[in-house]
């Protein structure tokens, strides 16, 4: 069921169907016999009771006051009264922009980050049964979409998606054609949440090893979903059958970033693996960060300052 009209101040555009629904609707059904009244006051007029005889454009239902359509002179305060329950709304009806498919003052603004999910669905649950067709316009140009009942855009946002999207519902009531327009101003912005990826730990690591043994070099980074992490080392080691890059492990952090870990496994360490730079790199569209590992024979470890030594 359509939710009630809880906002006390409402702005609508002239010429469109409009309704007010009070917020004690379920209660009103229980007390069918209770007198329920709608009033309007504007300027000099104080609390004029509304009924279908007041205007051919007004319709009253259990919980709803409908306008077919709303016009400029409907501006004013509206009251619903039932027993000791009262609800009040201030209605401001503004002029339609005759030179555009939408009225600037009746636009909902949305900011969408580039590459993030972007959706526009043309729905109107209250008038749903009366709607013949619905069209979606971008900057007042009709978009050709498959579904003409509920046109929808679902995609990853691109900068070209920026613009004014207007859902126009066409409906019939008492032999007359009406339309209801809902417009969104979509602004596409750069991904604001991207971090500068960073490799964890010291930039240079000396690892003490023994010939013939194995070693695992673990590289960890904090990065974005789009970023990549990999090992880089000398071309001469490129086809070394003893060097293995293990599968990457990633865990999402509570902030929506990623913690990645990539292990380089060197088996049966030989002389050719010593004193060579094994670089771990994290790359993004904003740059790269690299940390280096150097394998050093345990016997030679006395020559290395303690602060750069990794066991």
């Amino acid at each position: 069921a359509e939710s009630c009209t809880s906002r006390p101040h409402i702005t609508v555009v002239e010429g469109e169907p409009f309704y007010l629904k009070h917020c004690s609707c379920s209660l009103a059904h229980e007390i069918e016999t209770t007198t329920k009244s709608w009033y309007k006051s504007s300027g000099s007029q104080e609390h004029v009771e509304l009924n279908p005889r007041s205007s051919s454009r007004i319709a009253l239902h259990d919980c709803v006051l409908e306008f077919w359509p709303v016009e400029l002179n409907d501006t004013g305060s509206y009251f619903f009264q039932m027993k000791n329950y009262t609800q009040k709304w201030k209605l401001n009806v503004i002029r339609r922009n005759k030179h555009s498919c939408f009225t600037e003052r009746q636009v909902t603004s949305k900011i969408v980050e580039v590459k993030k999910f972007f959706q526009i669905t043309c729905e109107n649950s209250y008038y749903q049964t009366l709607v013949n067709s619905t069209s979606l316009y971008k900057n007042c140009k009709k978009l050709l979409l498959e579904n003409n009942k509920n046109p929808t855009i679902k995609k990853n946002a691109e900068f070209e998606d920026q613009g004014y999207y207007s859902c126009v519902h066409f409906l019939h009531h008492n032999g007359k054609l009406f339309n209801i327009t809902k417009t969104f101003n979509i602004t596409i912005v750069e991904d604001r949440s991207n971090i500068v990826p960073v490799l964890l730990g010291p930039k240079l690591n000396h690892v003490a090893v023994e010939l013939g043994k194995n070693v695992r070099l673990n590289c960890s980074a904090l990065l974005n979903e789009e970023d990549v992490i990999y090992w880089m080392f000398g071309e001469e080691n490129g086809s070394d059958p003893n060097i293995h890059e293990e599968k990457e492990m990633r865990i999402m952090t509570p902030e929506g970033k990623w913690h990645a870990s990539k292990v380089l496994r060197i088996e049966n360490i030989g002389e050719s693996n010593l004193n060579v730079l094994y670089n771990c790199t994290v790359a993004s569209t904003g740059g790269t960060d690299t940390k280096s590992f150097i394998l050093v024979r345990k016997a030679d470890m006395a020559d290395i300052p303690g602060h750069v030594f990794t066991r």
Epitope: D227, V228, M232, T281, A283, S284, G286, T288
Partner: nanobody, 116 residues
């Protein structure tokens, strides 16, 4: 203009072959090492599976060694990935990008599906 456009993916049976291509534009292609990256189903990140240096030296991750071959044609600004003896675990979206340097914007990728 999209700087990287991948193509050549498709549906293939286990043991089959595919050749992926990646056309690059907007940067001096021959100066950069290039890589093919794999995004496996359900994974939200891409992992390097093969790369080729500007001089032509290549390297592969263990799981594709001996089955995949990366090559490049600097005259055409294109990098290729020849995939042989395909396995169901090779099913993924494959992307190309630079390697060892600031990444270019990712292309749309090309889907490779290996059925058993």
């Amino acid at each position: 203009d999209v700087p990287l456009q991948e193509s050549g993916g498709g549906l293939v049976q286990t043991g089959g072959s595919l050749r992926l291509s990646c056309a690059a534009s907007g940067f001096t292609f021959n100066s950069y090492a290039m890589g093919w990256y794999q995004q496996a189903p359900g994974k939200k990140y891409r992992e390097l599976v093969a790369h080729i240096g500007s001089g032509g030296s290549t390297r592969y991750i263990d799981s594709v060694k001996g089955r995949f071959t990366i090559s490049r044609d600097n005259a055409k600004n294109t990098v290729y990935l020849q995939m042989n003896s395909l396995k169901p675990e090779d099913t993924a979206v494959y992307y190309c990008n630079v390697y060892g340097a600031t990444l270019r914007s990712w292309g749309q990728g090309t889907q490779v599906t290996v059925s058993s």
